[in-house]
């Protein structure tokens, strides 16, 4: 216990707890993909621990592995709606500094209405991810159908 | 380094390692759309640490953000019969106590049979988690199929 | 405060930040439905910290519950092709030691062409987790499309 | 092992329709799909359809009018049809099958070499 | 459709000497990771017989000396050395849509 001890302690603002979950804000103008969030707990369940948004989009605070996921819901969908809009595909990435850009996580919705995942990626302070859905169909602003958000895991 | 000695250190029971896994025990009776889980190692490799089940629902022991995440499975299934029986949904949120009662997280089953989604949420303590499912076809029970669980994240 | 101080403290390397995110490498052979996977830097976002890769297998190093995730994308795959093609199941499995093998997390695609779910899971020293795709789809080798990751999160 | 053995008549007159059966072992119908390929005297090789494992079928463009493929899973027997058949059809005609992985041919039948003459 | 064109349309290669057959496609048939290119091998009388799956995976019991290469829309067959059972037909074939398209074929003759 004493040999325990004598390792090196970890202080809690080092556990790097940095979280967020954001909740839909609105869609991007005409050829902007891009999905703009929102986040606070002035707006329900949302909410950012260390990561910031930036014009919509998230903002990572300190380096590590992240463990990203999102949900994201078609609105007013059945599948044949999505099959009838096909290809609608949602790409989670890294859009900003442009030197380190590229795509992280990618589904198709096919013939369903809703995609959900979520994967550990190496981010560092100052990327930027963008969540971009091409389409045509409008994705669900209700806060349990769709949502995204990051969790830090270690350095 | 003797400056991060100095900071406060973080003790292992503060941690807040509250997890759970769980696996499907059965459906509600008639008019209750609940689903009925179960844990621990006697069952398999669900287990409960922290979070304790009432009447086959979550109920969590210590406030913090957690991932929540969910798998369900329909029994008997393909992409024909969950189209017949449509919609089929899943939804999980807050039961109780009634004036923290809200959604969490919803899916609809469309022309898939599986359903597996997971997400960053704050709970506090006594919140009881239910998981609804609308529609008529059984989930399945298989361990591997069908699971339900949540992780203790940050304060 | 004192009383804090005077608890267990956690030393950093006792925390247990076994995490791994992998990039699919190659199928297997002929009656051999094990997908191959690969990590590390030099690969792109892929990387192994505490689980090791066994002849394209991940193998666990440290006790503990951990988060197991996956997504696996078919290639060339519309929802037509998906059932054309069924049934296609992954499933995630220990399939080392032989006495601990057992079957985690288990999907069928159905009418989609991707499948990504995560549960968390006792794993001990030494199990080897194999994922088996059965059906005559390949899987996308796409990084954003197919990956596979552990993560630990406690004792 | 997986085989798979052809039968069939091997003159047609034209204007007639050709029937051939693709009987198959070592695998079931209901995992994998049989294709079917022709090659034309002197020429390359030309795909003409598939029946998927489901029962699901795909047809060349070029023959969707005139051909049908069925099949019988309990039987492991595969059914090829192709109507109003004229000279330039003549040709050898294939079934073969995939393993493990769909997207090229692993296994072939030996062959029918179809003949349409009068 | 996506058109093979293969050439040489033959080609005569002294035994022992390297044998190259080329595969151009209309379009890529690269996606996903994979290049969906394949080559057979045929014989007067018998069906043709797979060498490579996926522009470069030599098929089961098929001597090393025949190699695949290539990605997106060219394609490479080698054989080398090349032998006299080698004499045969050389087909390439795509598989990244519907429908699945064969090359003219290169015969190719042993000096």
């Known amino acids: 216990q004493r040999f325990a001890q004598a390792q090196q302690q970890l202080p809690l603002e080092s556990l790097g707890w940095d979280v967020a979950e954001l909740q839909l804000n609105h869609t991007g103008p005409q050829q902007d993909p891009r999905l703009y969030w929102q986040g606070g707990p002035a707006l329900g369940r949302s909410f950012l621990h260390g990561p910031e948004l930036d014009k919509g989009q998230l903002r990572i605070h300190r380096d590590g592995i992240y463990m990203v996921h999102i949900q994201v819901t078609l609105a007013i969908c059945s599948s044949t709606t999505a099959s009838r809009h096909h290809p609608t595909t949602l790409a989670v990435g890294i859009c900003s500094p442009a030197s380190r850009s590229i795509s992280l996580l990618r589904l198709s919705f096919h013939q369903g209405c809703t995609i959900a995942s979520q994967r550990l990626t190496p981010l560092a302070r100052g990327d930027t991810l963008c969540t971009n859905l091409t389409g045509t169909l409008l994705p669900s602003r209700n806060t349990d159908e769709t949502f995204f958000g990051v969790q830090w895991v270690r350095p | 380094q003797r400056f991060a000695q100095a900071q406060q250190q973080l003790p292992l029971e503060s941690l807040g390692w509250d997890v759970a896994e769980l696996q499907l025990n059965h459906t509600g009776p008639q008019q209750d759309p609940r689903l009925y889980w179960q844990g621990g190692p006697a069952l398999g490799r669900s287990f409960l640490h922290g979070p304790e089940l009432d009447k086959g629902q979550l109920r969590i022991h210590r406030d913090g953000i957690y991932m929540v995440h969910i798998q369900v499975t329909l029994a008997i299934c393909s992409s024909t019969t969950a189209s017949r029986h449509h919609p089929t949904t899943l939804a999980v949120g807050i039961c109780s106590p009634a004036s923290r009662s809200i959604s969490l997280l919803r899916l609809s089953f469309h022309q898939g049979c599986t359903i597996a989604s997971q997400r960053l949420t704050p709970l506090a303590r006594g919140d009881t988690l239910c998981t609804n499912l609308t529609g008529t076809l059984l989930p399945s029970r298989n361990t591997d199929e069908t699971f339900f669980g949540v992780q203790w994240v940050r304060p | 405060q004192r009383f804090a101080q005077a608890q267990q403290q956690l030393p950093l390397e006792s925390l247990g930040w076994d995490v791994a995110e992998l990039q699919l490498n190659h199928t297997g052979p002929q009656q051999d439905p094990r997908l191959y996977w690969q990590g590390g830097p030099a690969l792109g976002r892929s990387f192994l910290h505490g689980p090791e890769l066994d002849k394209g297998q991940l193998r666990i190093h440290r006790d503990g519950i951990y988060m197991v995730h996956i997504q696996v994308t078919l290639a060339i795959c519309s929802s037509t092709t998906a059932s054309r093609h069924h049934p296609t199941t992954l499933a995630v499995g220990i399939c080392s030691p032989a006495s601990r093998s057992i079957s985690l997390l288990r999907l069928s695609f159905h009418q989609g062409c991707t499948i990504a779910s995560q549960r968390l899971t006792p794993l001990a020293r030494g199990d080897t987790l194999c994922t088996n795709l059965t059906g005559t789809l390949l899987p996308s080798r796409n990084t954003d499309e197919t990956f596979f990751g552990v993560q630990w999160v406690r004792p | 092992q997986v085989q798979l053995k052809q039968s069939g008549p091997g003159l047609v007159q034209p204007s007639q329709s050709l029937s051939i059966t693709c009987t198959v072992s070592g695998f079931s119908l209901t995992s994998y799909g049989v294709h079917w390929v022709r090659q034309s005297p002197g020429k390359g090789l030309e795909w003409l359809g598939v029946?998927?494992?489901?029962?699901?079928?795909d047809y060349n463009a070029a023959f969707i009018s005139r051909l049908s493929i069925s099949k019988d899973n309990s039987k492991s027997q595969v059914f090829f049809k192709m109507n109003s058949l004229q000279a330039n059809d003549t040709a050898i005609y294939y079934c073969?099958?995939?393993?493990?992985?769909?997207?090229?041919?692993?296994?072939w039948g030996q062959g029918t070499l179809v003949t349409v003459s009068a | 459709d996506i058109v093979l064109t293969q050439s040489p349309a033959s080609l005569a290669v002294s035994l022992g000497q390297r044998a190259t057959i080329s595969c151009r496609a209309s379009?890529?048939?690269?996606?996903?990771?994979?290049?969906?290119m394949h080559w057979y091998q045929q014989k007067p009388g018998q069906p043709p017989k797979l060498l490579i799956y996926l522009a470069s995976n030599l098929e089961s019991g098929v001597p090393a000396r025949f190699s695949g290469s290539g990605s997106g829309t060219d394609f490479t067959l080698n054989i080398h050395p090349v032998e006299e059972e080698d004499a045969a037909t050389y087909s390439c074939q795509h598989s990244r849509e519907l429908p699945w398209t064969f090359g003219g074929g290169t015969k190719l003759e042993i000096k």
């Open positions: 073969a099958t995939y393993y493990r992985y769909d997207g090229w041919f692993a296994y």
């Open positions: 029946i998927w494992s489901g029962g699901s079928t």
């Open positions: 379009k890529s048939v690269s996606t996903s990771g994979y290049s969906y």
